[in-house]
Interface confidence: low
Amino acid sequence: AAKPGLHFIDQHRAALIARVTNVEWLLDALYGKVLTDEQYQAVRAEPTNPSKMRKLFSFTPAWNWTCKDLLLQALRESQSYLVEDLERS
């Protein structure tokens, strides 16, 4: 069940880490907006998609709601079926 007051990406952190496959696309969408060059490289350096997503999530505590919306929008564009599935859960 959704937790009130939490952003979608925080509510579904574990599922996103496990199920997002197109991480590179997300990085390109977020680069220069909410990700610095160093952050972008740090995520890219991770060996697997789950570890890339885990690394990406290590930066999100410093993000405000609008920044998290950018990630959600990128997810909708890259893996809309996943977002829809999580919204139904």
């Epitope: 952190r13 930066f59 410093a62």
Partner: antibody
Framework: QVQLKQSGPGLVQPSQSLSITCKVS????????VHWVRQSPGKGLEWLGV???????EYNEAFISRLTISKDNSKSQILFRMNSLQPADTAIYYC?????????????WGQGTTLTVSS | DIQMTQTSSSLSASLGDRVTISCRAS??????LNWYQQRPDGTVKLLIY???KVHSGVPSRFSGSGSGTDFSLTISNLEQEDFATYYC?????????FGGGTKLEIK
Amino acid sequence: QVQLKQSGPGLVQPSQSLSITCKVSDFSLSHYGVHWVRQSPGKGLEWLGVIWSGGTTEYNEAFISRLTISKDNSKSQILFRMNSLQPADTAIYYCARKGDFYGDYFDYWGQGTTLTVSS
Amino acid sequence: DIQMTQTSSSLSASLGDRVTISCRASQDISNYLNWYQQRPDGTVKLLIYYTSKVHSGVPSRFSGSGSGTDFSLTISNLEQEDFATYYCQQGNTRPFTFGGGTKLEIK
């Protein structure tokens, strides 16, 4: 400058609970996570848990059944509560801010709260 | 859990010396290795994060290196205030874990 100031009791009896307040300054709890670490004579430094900027929590599985971390962003305060204390919980308890980027590290620490569990 | 091992629990050195403190992880932690200094009064300070990045305000005589499972902290030109206990910590995998500490004592 960034500061974390802790307050809490020094002596607690077995089976009772511990409450520590960590009051932060010069940064916002709505933008930074805060971790809790303890240092006991027998086990060294142990990571206990974290409360993220959005309010979600993650706990070390060894403590998940008796640990609660909460916060009040408007008061810049985090509350750490641990139940069912035993002498083995005698330790120094620290709050520490999560650093930016590059995994999880702790860039500023509180002064520590020394806890003795004894009857 | 990932075990962090600091092989030396204590080291003796003199003012002006260069010392290296080692830390080993039980599995690959990439570069997510951090170093802290603890003074006798309990005060803890971050020195190095992500293996080699020096935290703001930390003197340049502190440096870190390594990757994977083997890491080291080097302090060059030791000063009086450097005699303290040093801990490594992995920030790669939950639960985050620490080494047992290395106490740097004056010779």
